[in-house]
Interface confidence: low
């Protein structure tokens, strides 16, 4: 038997993926566990195998369909269960009635690129990935720039309170290497959270012209 507290957290990417993490304080040795998804009003259901991500936590992705297919709506409720093998049976370890559009976490923005770079500024664009058409323009973004000698955690956050898939970074230092990241969040959903940060985009500002002050 498994003792200890259990935490089961899932997010919907707004299209065809539910990602889950299950944490269990207590011994769970070589046990096969799965997440089962049972929508209340749909003909499909899905299962994924939980894989260890740390000593006491497991994760998996429920792939509901092709990446851009709209598999759930704001009125759906999906019963999510953690099932673990105990001998010849499966034991239910955790359960939640999951409201997908109250628990959103989008995919990280993709296709980051430098549109234009100068000595002190850089214009960067990106695209959102696998985001539902239901959001229309109801999205916000956070961005951060990594300067030399600093960490990502020290980088100040820039907030874009609208669906704006570009930013113009100002007051940069000439001839300097920077990295840039962006993340996205729908305005909808009580438990909605930020997407993961995008892959960093590295860029370098242009050097100052010779004989000019910087």
């Amino acid at each position: 038997a498994v003792n200890g507290t259990s935490r089961f957290t899932c997010f919907y990417n707004s299209r065809a993926n539910i990602s889950c993490v299950w944490s269990q304080d207590g011994a769970l040795q070589d046990t096969s566990c799965q997440v089962h998804a049972w929508p209340d009003r749909r003909r499909w259901n899905q299962t994924c195998e939980l894989l260890p991500v740390s000593q006491a936590s497991w994760a998996c992705n429920l792939i509901l369909g092709t990446p851009d297919s709209q598999k759930l709506t704001a009125v759906d409720i999906v019963t999510l269960r953690v099932m673990c093998r105990e001998g010849v049976r499966w034991r239910m370890m955790a359960i939640q009635d999951f409201k997908p559009f109250e628990n959103l976490r989008l995919m990280a923005p993709i296709s980051l690129q430098v549109v234009h770079v100068e000595t002190h500024r850089c214009n960067i664009s990106w695209k959102i990935s696998q985001a539902s058409h239901y959001f229309e323009r109801h999205l916000e973004f956070e961005a951060r720039t990594l300067s030399p000698g600093h960490t990502w955690e020290e980088a100040p956050l820039m907030t874009l309170k609208q669906k704006q898939e570009w930013i113009c970074l100002e007051t940069l230092t000439p001839d300097t290497q920077y990295e840039f990241q962006v993340r996205v969040k729908p305005l909808q959903g009580e438990f909605t959270t930020w997407s993961p940060w995008s892959q960093p985009l590295a860029f370098r500002t242009k050097p100052a012209a010779l004989g000019k002050d910087t």
């Epitope: 799965q34 089962h36 049972w38 003909r43 499909w44 259901n45 899905q46 299962t47 195998e49 099932m83 001998g87 010849v88 049976r89 499966w90 239910m92």
Partner: antibody, heavy 119, light 106 residues
Framework: EVQLLESGGGLVQPGGSLRLSCAAS????????VHWIRQAPGKGLEWLGV???????DYNAAFISRLTISKDNSKNTVYFQMNSLRAEDTAVYYC?????????????WGQGTLVTVSS | DIQMTQSPSSLSASVGDRVTITCQAS?????LYWYQQRPGKAPRLLIY???NLASGVPSRFSGSGSGTSYTFTISSLQPEDIATYYC?????????FGQGTKVEIK
Amino acid sequence: EVQLLESGGGLVQPGGSLRLSCAASGFSVTSYGVHWIRQAPGKGLEWLGVIWSGGSTDYNAAFISRLTISKDNSKNTVYFQMNSLRAEDTAVYYCARAGDYNYDGFAYWGQGTLVTVSS
Amino acid sequence: DIQMTQSPSSLSASVGDRVTITCQASQSVSFLYWYQQRPGKAPRLLIYDTSNLASGVPSRFSGSGSGTSYTFTISSLQPEDIATYYCQQWSTYPLTFGQGTKVEIK
């Protein structure tokens, strides 16, 4: 509606092999285990094995050396292959599925397919 | 393997009678299932997890028991209940069934 449809039964020579299909509809074999159970004429039920949703299998130890259960997720079909058949393997072969969980027992059964092992 | 022994192997009762079938396991089992099989048909699940009625099953059917001793009851036998009844354990591989109890109408 959940349905299971077996096919592939018939007359098989002793020493020969048998390949049965179980076509599933109304659910996905990637979400449920599918079991095979047989019943010899006038006899009781005998559990042979199962293929789970993830593709792993459990077999009755009495048959493990000559039994293979597999599946094709794209066809939503489970396959049952038994080798070295003998007269006592003559039976109606059923595929079955548990309810939402194993705890629910064999809630869904196919109609069965008769296999006769005889020369 | 866990041996499941049903008794009686057959019985004859009148319509309206209370019918009881027992299933004895050779070792303790956690959960027991009961199936009905009419001639020429696939088995039908009646009782799961010892005492729970499967979907669409009339309430005259019931199950009880624990450990190695389990009981299946038809509170008022009906003509459509003519069938063979099987118990089954789902605690240890291989899953095993009782040999069956054939129920007939007098």
